[in-house]
Amino acid sequence: EEELQVIQPDKSVLVAAGETATLRCTATSLIPVGPIQWFRGAGPGRELIYNQKEGHFPRVTTVSDLTKRNNMDFSIRISNITPADAGTYYCVKFRKGSPDDVEFKSGAGTELSVRAKPS
């Protein structure tokens, strides 16, 4: 069985301020078991944008229903985009661990650029 890959097909996305950004991500396998998280930026200072396992993120909705057990589409929508949302977003697969889940594989990233609202 081939190892899971995290695919972010869009290298960049351009969204007008006030609109909704769709950031696409799919996994190629259900194995290993574990959640997906989305981050803006990389490294220790990265910002958590969405965590499948915990919490409610008011501006973020998933494109597909993650409660479905065979789901492999982890794309998200971020509403009411502002210039402060610009950056590179990474879709990251975690492997279930105890006590903490372990980062398993990251997508290549999608750069979100924000176009100013026409005046």
């Epitope: 959640p35 965590n51 915990e54 919490g55 409610h56 998933t62 229903d65 993650l66 409660t67 279930k96």
Partner: antibody, heavy 120, light 107 residues
Framework: QVQLVESGGGVVQPGRSLRLSCAAS????????MIWVRQAPGKGLEWVAS????????YYADSVKGRFTISRDNSKNRLYLQMNSLRAEDTAVYYC?????????????WGQGTMVTVSS | DTVLTQSPDSLAVSLGQRATINCGAS??????MHWYQQKPGQQPKLLIY???NLEAGVPSRFSGSGSGTDFTLTISSLQAEDVAVYYC?????????FGQGTKVEIK
């Protein structure tokens, strides 16, 4: 098999405190968000509070905010509900339930409940 | 808050007949609607999750449908053991909310 067993209910006077406990077994407790739901006598279900698997995210119903505190101890496989400043309208059966992964998931197992009666 | 309204409040159906319960949401909950069964003196039991998915071990006579604001739970052929109160519940956004419940009885 999955088991959730609530305890700590009883009769208490208005304004007093009570601490409910829920003992979990038969599953990896630290993988699951946990919830308290209550049901007043002859009434429907009301969500009270929820806590994520690592306690990072906690939410309360407006009706209990500032009075109730939900917590968990993953090393002991236990969920708690500390209830302060109890009111007559808090009288209900209190159920603990588990929720796999994130906020959108359903409550797939429930305990049998523990009765809390607030009365002078 | 998202208000869930079930209809009817109670329902009497002959054995072997179809029972249909509706749940309307005050705003879209996408597909994050779940259905529970509660028999007298027992805790609730999950029947259907995310609008249309049958929970493991639940008889196939139970089914769910809908998305957005309108959802339906159907019992295709009512059995005596289905006498219970049925609740819908949304998990699209906090706070979690339940419908007021629908009591199903045998006619």
């Amino acid at each position: 098999q999955v088991q959730l067993v609530e305890s700590g209910g009883g009769v208490v006077q208005p304004g007093r405190s009570l601490r409910l406990s829920c003992a979990a077994s038969g599953f990896t407790f630290s993988d699951y968000g946990m919830i308290w739901v209550r049901q007043a006598p002859g009434k429907g279900l009301e969500w009270v509070a929820s806590i994520s698997s690592s306690s990072s995210y906690i939410y309360y119903a407006d009706s209990v905010k500032g009075r109730f505190t939900i917590s968990r101890d993953n090393s002991k496989n236990r969920l708690y509900l500390q209830m302060n400043s109890l009111r007559a309208e808090d009288t209900a059966v209190y159920y603990c339930a588990r929720r796999y992964y994130g906020f959108n998931y359903p409550f797939d197992y429930w305990g049998q409940g523990t009765m809390v009666t607030v009365s002078s | 808050d998202t208000v869930l309204t079930q209809s009817p409040d109670s329902l009497a159906v002959s054995l072997g007949q179809r029972a249909t319960i509706n749940c309307g949401a005050s705003k879209s909950v996408r597909t994050y609607m779940h259905w529970y069964q509660q028999k007298p003196g027992q805790q609730p039991k999950l029947l259907i999750y995310s609008a249309s998915n049958l929970e493991a071990g639940v008889p196939s006579r139970f089914s769910g449908s809908g998305s957005g604001t309108d959802f339906t739970l159907t019992i295709s052929s009512l059995q005596a053991e289905d006498v219970a109160v049925y609740y819908c519940q949304q998990s699209n956004e906090p706070p979690y909310t339940f419908g007021q419940g629908t009591k199903v009885e045998i006619k």
